[in-house]
Interface confidence: low
Amino acid sequence: EDLNKVFPPEVAVFEPSEAEISHTQKATLVCLATGFFPDHVELSWWVNGKEVHSGVSTDPQPLKEQPALNDSRYCLSSRLRVSATFWQNPRNHFRCQVQFYGLSENDEWTQDRAKPVTQIVSAEAWGRADC
Amino acid sequence: PNIQNPDPAVYQLRDSKSSDKSVCLFTDFDSQTNVSQSKDSDVYITDKTVLDMRSMDFKSNSAVAWSNKSDFACANAFNNSIIPEDTFFPSPESSC
């Protein structure tokens, strides 16, 4: 990879819709990682400081933001679904973590071009009561 | 998976840090429903994935759409997919 083209992701967490909560008694949080290159990322969800796997669904592979470009940046989304009551507890903390690797194992770097450090980029949300 | 009680819906979710950013969640649709990519290159739609809430013995399909376009709206984000009418559930403004 051309190291000048290495871009870490921007990460955002989107809070559940009140309509979903009232309609299903469940709450889905969405995590969006955008604008990264290359496409070497690992996404995980953490609730109250612990990694969770139940209720998680992540895209099988990143999407190209500009499919026609060879060196397009990428994006990736993931969902975490919990019960409405769990989301509505303001003490519950939700964090989406994206680990980004600026180089693949095959990439080379020289002493005048430092290897990009693996970065962890996160976004968070706190549970919200009705009011 | 065989979704037991499909209840297809599209919801709009807002960024926890910036209320002017949002994404659209299409969820609880049956496994026969295919999610089509947008014909608009500025609109991103993910493939459907399966989510398993093991503690509740509940599985669901979902996909997400988003765009930076000012005229993008969840009400018609998944128009290229064959989905039931009136699946969009607007959220009321926060009354807090």
């Epitope: - | 709009q12 949002s22 000012s70 005229d71 993008f72 709206a73 009400a75 009136d86 969009f88 607007p90």
Partner: nanobody
């Protein structure tokens, strides 16, 4: 922008009827779903009924068979006909318009409905 002004609320006895009106103005061509919501004291705002521009309606389970949403496009008005009213229908009723483009949601200021003997 889209402006919404509700009217028709008031005090009514259980079993009685009311018709709420929502006069709409502005860029109503943007709207694809009209709706009525209500909020009782200390409770979350909830959807009562919605009407798409295609004519499809959706009702909360608690009002099915009693409430009817309709529109008169010539008068730029959306109605909520409420029959067989119950004390639990007491709330502030809000008119809502859902747009296809940002900012997505428009709201009126609400009209009070009180069902009491």
């Amino acid at each position: 922008e889209v402006q919404l002004v509700e009217s028709g609320g008031g005090l009514v006895q259980p079993g009685g009827s009311l018709r709420l009106s929502c006069i709409t103005s502005g860029e109503t061509f943007k709207i694809n779903i009209w709706g009525w919501y209500r909020q009782a004291p200390g409770k979350q705002r909830e959807l009562v009924a919605s009407l798409t521009i295609g004519g499809a309606t959706n009702y909360a389970d608690s009002v099915k068979g009693r409430f009817t949403i309709s529109e008169d496009s010539a008068k730029n008005t959306v109605y909520l006909q409420m029959n067989s009213l119950k004390p639990e229908d007491t709330a502030v009723y809000f008119c809502n318009a859902k747009s296809r483009i940002y900012p997505y949601d428009y709201w009126g200021r609400g009209t009070q409905v009180t069902v009491s003997s």
